[in-house]
């Protein structure tokens, strides 16, 4: 008996061939001997089966001795043995229809679980193997689960269902809703304008939701809300903003925030949370602000940084075009009695300068100038 695998919702064509290459009488029946369709001369006739409105044949092939049964919009319950009767012989074809669906939605938040469920006919024992867009293979029976979805899991998942050494392939498009970056860090000199950007890693036609930037300043004992906002069809409207700092928010995507000036009391880390309509759970992006200040007080030249710096970052003070006078893995460095000239304060990571502030030290009889 020939086995044919079909996909739920698809169309399948079951073949039936006579030895004579001409149009002769044929009938297709199911395992209960109920007629599905056949011919009377050149006319297609249909029987009382439940496939009535979804069954068809190709009259153009009858003259060549081919009498296919076409079943449209396949259902799991169409799985059956179909019998073609032609020239006093019977050809049996076993049709097995499978369906593969993603749990609830194909748009999932980063960190959520994806469950793929296989619908299969009674008596079948298929195996399923799925390959994610990043090449990860998962295997299972009726259900396959992937926990903690990551951004790289966005794209087409290809799943192969194997039964009776035949296979059928399903493609499911999954969209992982996430920010492009889980975390970002902004380095600024004191007084500079700060731009925070929160680009999304997906595009949808209508994006509606709400969000909040919650901030923990390094110098503050507790965290607080800096801004709350709504998102309606990709238009941003500010709901509430703290009075200090006076943040501004762009009206269009990507989500964009401007802090008029970087000050030591703002240095710290924040968490932008975005809740999307009709989704349980939230998207998060961490953002960090490091602020540098270089000052000269009397005979002491000081450079300080505030905010979340890694212990491997190096803070240095050097006179322009000279070797560093002081260089430490600390958040403050200073030079006593600095000589006149343009001094540079540098925050660097493995030799790469992340932040630089210049301060001009004048001869001792005058006051310092900040360029």
């Amino acid at each position: 008996k020939k086995v044919v695998l079909g996909k739920k919702g698809d169309t399948v064509e079951l073949t039936c061939t006579a030895s004579q290459k001409k149009s002769i009488q044929f009938h297709w029946k199911n395992s209960n001997q109920i007629k599905i369709l056949g011919n009377q001369g050149s006319f297609l006739t249909k029987g009382p089966s439940k496939l009535n409105d979804r069954a068809d044949s190709r009259r153009s092939l009858w003259d060549q001795g081919n009498f296919p049964l076409i079943i449209k919009n396949l259902k799991i319950e169409d799985s059956d043995t179909y019998i073609c009767e032609v020239e006093d012989q019977k050809e049996e074809v076993q049709l097995l229809v499978f369906g593969l669906t993603a749990n609830s939605d194909t748009h999932l938040l980063q960190g959520q679980s994806l469950t793929l469920t296989l619908e299969s006919p009674p008596g079948s024992s298929p195996s399923v193997q799925c390959r994610s867009p990043r090449g990860k293979n998962i295997q299972g029976g009726k259900t396959l689960s992937v926990s903690q979805l990551e951004l790289q899991d966005s794209g087409t998942w290809t799943c192969t269902v194997l039964q009776n050494q035949k296979k059928v392939e399903f493609k499911i498009d999954i969209v992982v809703l996430a920010f492009q970056k889980a975390s970002s860090i902004v380095y600024k000199k004191e007084g500079e304008q700060v731009e925070f950007s929160f680009p999304l890693a997906f595009t949808v036609e209508k994006l509606t939701g709400s969000g909040e930037l919650w901030w923990q300043a390094e110098r503050a004992s507790s965290s607080k809300s800096w801004i709350t906002f709504d998102l309606k069809n990709k238009e941003v409207s500010v709901k509430r903003v703290t009075q200090d700092p006076k943040l501004q928010m762009g009206k269009k995507l990507p989500l964009h925030l401007t802090l008029p000036q970087a000050l030591p009391q703002y240095a710290g880390s924040g968490n932008l949370t975005l809740a999307l309509e009709a989704k349980t759970g939230k998207l998060h992006q961490e953002v960090n602000l490091v602020v540098m200040r270089a000052t000269q007080l009397q005979k002491n030249l000081t450079c300080e940084v505030w905010g979340p710096t890694s212990p491997k970052l190096m803070l240095s003070l050097k006179l322009e075009n000279k070797e560093a006078k002081v260089s430490k893995r600390e958040k403050a460095v200073w030079v006593l009695n600095p000589e006149a000239g343009m001094w540079q304060c540098l925050l660097s990571d493995s030799g790469q300068v992340l932040l630089e502030s210049n301060i001009k030290v004048l001869p001792t009889w005058s006051t310092p100038v900040q360029p």
Epitope: W214, S222, S225
Partner: antibody, heavy 119, light 107 residues
Framework: EVQLVESGGGLVQPGGSLRLSCAAS????????MSWVRQAPGKGLEWVAN????????YYVDSVKGRFTISRDNAKNSLYLQLNSLRAEDTAMYYC????????????WGQGTLVTVSS | DIQMTQSPSSVSASVGDRVTITCRAS??????LAWYQQKPGKAPKVLIY???SFQSGVPSRFSGSGSGTDFILTISSLQPEDFATYYC?????????FGQGTKVEIK
Amino acid sequence: EVQLVESGGGLVQPGGSLRLSCAASGFTFSSYWMSWVRQAPGKGLEWVANINQDGSEKYYVDSVKGRFTISRDNAKNSLYLQLNSLRAEDTAMYYCAREGGQWLSLDYWGQGTLVTVSS
Amino acid sequence: DIQMTQSPSSVSASVGDRVTITCRASQGISSWLAWYQQKPGKAPKVLIYGVSSFQSGVPSRFSGSGSGTDFILTISSLQPEDFATYYCQQANSFPWTFGQGTKVEIK
């Protein structure tokens, strides 16, 4: 430790006035919106009014508009609710609450002060 | 004004039971929804904000879900200290409004 302590409640005749106070401590009072919420005996919670950090924005529930006034004194770390033209239906426990929680939630509440309007 | 309707108004349950309280807003409130717990003679305390996020210190048996206009507070396994009245509250638009409350009583 964040603390909110209400005072000023008491028995007042219909048409009378009261001034409720809320003394805040343990946090930077001037950085937060503040709210008043009331609860009639045996009934549910009803949000009454709120005020922004510097007192320039105020919102009220319709039933108290024109009769109640919310204000604050950041120098004294105090929130106030002036209750005028009081009615029997204003009888309730009045709570002061800080809008310091995420997603605009009321994260700290006082223990309340009882206002009874009766002749 | 946005009306918040809670159901049921009261529920009798035993320790270990799963309790579900629903809250329906008269119009969409996005994720501006919080749940509060109040015990007799005490001030309310926030359990959940932004529909589904826990306030720190709140046991994980409490969970929130929903979106738009329909929201649910679930207590997965009721503990003796959970017998109280629960309120939902919207902060989408002024005036902020609370649900009428759901009293969770001992069966």
